[in-house]
Interface confidence: medium
């Protein structure tokens, strides 16, 4: 079951999954000036069995020189909030990630991929939060959120994290304190949440509707 919402937003914090549950999908998005190859995969899918999980499908981008590159994001009917984009955080691979049964590692980058990775999480997925550079974490509890199913609807638990404006960075579990970026980035780019706004993902499986697909009942 896919989570029907994004993980909660925490001011001045970003979230990241340590590993991705089977069923998770990642959009094959390309950077400006590029697009998916013709009839190429729209997504990568974390699949596997109890002993091994991996990403199915490969994302491929090609130049879209002949295509209007100013095309806007076209929301599908559930769009309600503005898509936020920011520079993608470098993929993180904790040592214990591979040992998690039923989970996939962060997929390696593909050529000309977009600057933001768009994941579709499934129920049971956990994401961890950290304060962005220049903010310090005040923990009231776990700095994590889990997608749960309640009364037939999905919801994310609320992470217990507050980020205050002090020059110290809270880390993801098991992550080394990062070195300052040589280029440096303005605070306006780092003090907003890196959202993983989700997009619809194509399924390659054959899909059919039952022949007796409709019934009508007068009331």
């Amino acid at each position: 079951e896919l989570c029907d919402d994004d993980p909660p937003e925490i001011p001045h914090a970003t979230f990241k999954a340590m590993a991705y549950k089977e069923g998770t999908m990642l959009n094959c998005e390309c950077k400006r000036g590029f697009r998916r190859i013709k009839s190429g995969s729209l997504y990568m899918l974390c699949t596997g069995n109890s002993s091994h999980s991996s990403w199915d499908n490969q994302c491929q981008c090609t130049s879209s020189a002949t295509r209007n590159t100013t095309k806007q994001v076209t929301p599908q009917p559930e769009e309600q909030k503005e898509r936020k984009t920011t520079e993608m955080q470098s993929p993180m691979q904790p040592v214990d990630q591979a040992s998690l049964p039923g989970h996939c590692r962060e997929p390696p980058p593909w050529e000309n991929e977009a600057t933001e990775r768009i994941y579709h999480f499934v129920v049971g997925q956990m994401v961890y939060y950290q304060c962005v550079q220049g903010y310090r974490a005040l923990h009231r509890g776990p700095a994590e959120s889990v997608c749960k199913m309640t009364h037939g609807k999905t919801r994310w638990t609320q992470p217990q994290l507050i980020c205050t404006g002090e020059m110290e960075t809270s880390q993801f579990p098991g992550e080394e304190k990062p070195q300052a970026s040589p280029e440096g980035r303005p605070e306006s780019e780092t003090s907003c949440l890196v959202t993983t706004t989700d997009f619809q993902i194509q399924t390659e499986m054959a899909a059919t509707m039952e022949t007796s697909i409709f019934t009508t009942e007068y009331q």
Epitope: N68, K71, Q72, P75, E78, H120
Partner: antibody, heavy 111, light 106 residues
């Protein structure tokens, strides 16, 4: 006219709970008209202006079923009603059309 | 509002083009459906120019400016159908269909 009707759509062959679903209708001799959309776990619902306040879309993922409750029916609601699946799983962002359609059911509203 | 010509006629083996007009439609993703009499619609082109699996390469699409176009090359008798363009209108949160074009194979 003024009556109520409930349409049901039973899906199979794909993970129903992972897909947004739609109702689209077609009046006799006319074109396609979108009616309503519902996201995978019902958090996001949209209606065409022509049916807003009268029709209610819902789904039961445990039963792989989509529903359309139609109240205060009018003559202009007479049409073939199709249920259709959004091509891509999940719920927001890029929209890629509807790739699986039911065969349709005819609704006639007359006095 | 998406505007389509009510009808287009073409001889077998020739190329049919069906236009879908809309204000700045080139900034939206356009999808095309084929509907034969008595049948449900079938998605033939999505995201302007991509084809779902099973759709012949003869079907192609383009989108720029105020017009999206569905092109069917080497038209066959079996292509005779109604064709609809469709977009998602983010300003109204609505799915919008064009009025449809009846393709007649002479």
């Amino acid at each position: 006219p003024g009556g109520s009707l409930r349409l049901s759509c039973a899906a199979s062959g794909f993970t129903f709970s992972s897909y947004s679903m739609n109702w689209v209708r077609q009046a006799p001799g006319k074109g396609l008209e979108w009616v309503s959309s519902i996201s995978s776990s019902s958090s996001y619902i949209y209606y065409a202006d022509s049916v807003k306040g009268r029709f209610t879309i819902s789904r039961d993922n445990a039963k792989n079923s989509l529903y359309l409750q139609m109240n205060s029916l009018r003559a202009e609601d007479t049409a073939v009603y199709y249920c259709a699946r959004d091509q891509l799983a999940a719920r927001r962002g890029y929209y890629y059309g509807m790739d699986v359609w039911g065969q349709g059911t005819t609704v006639t509203v007359s006095s | 509002v998406l505007t389509q010509p009510p009808s287009v006629s073409v001889a077998p083996g020739q190329t049919a083009t069906i236009a879908c007009g809309g204000n700045n439609i080139g900034t939206k993703s356009v999808h095309w459906y084929q509907q034969k009499p008595g049948q449900a619609p079938v998605l033939v082109v999505y995201d302007d120019s991509d084809r779902p699996s099973g759709i012949p390469e003869r079907f192609s699409g383009s989108n720029s400016g105020n017009t999206a176009t569905l092109t069917i090359s080497r038209v066959e008798a079996g292509d005779e159908a109604d064709y609809y363009c469709q977009v998602w209108d983010s300003s109204s949160d609505h799915v919008v269909f064009g009025g449809g074009t009846k393709l007649t194979v002479l």
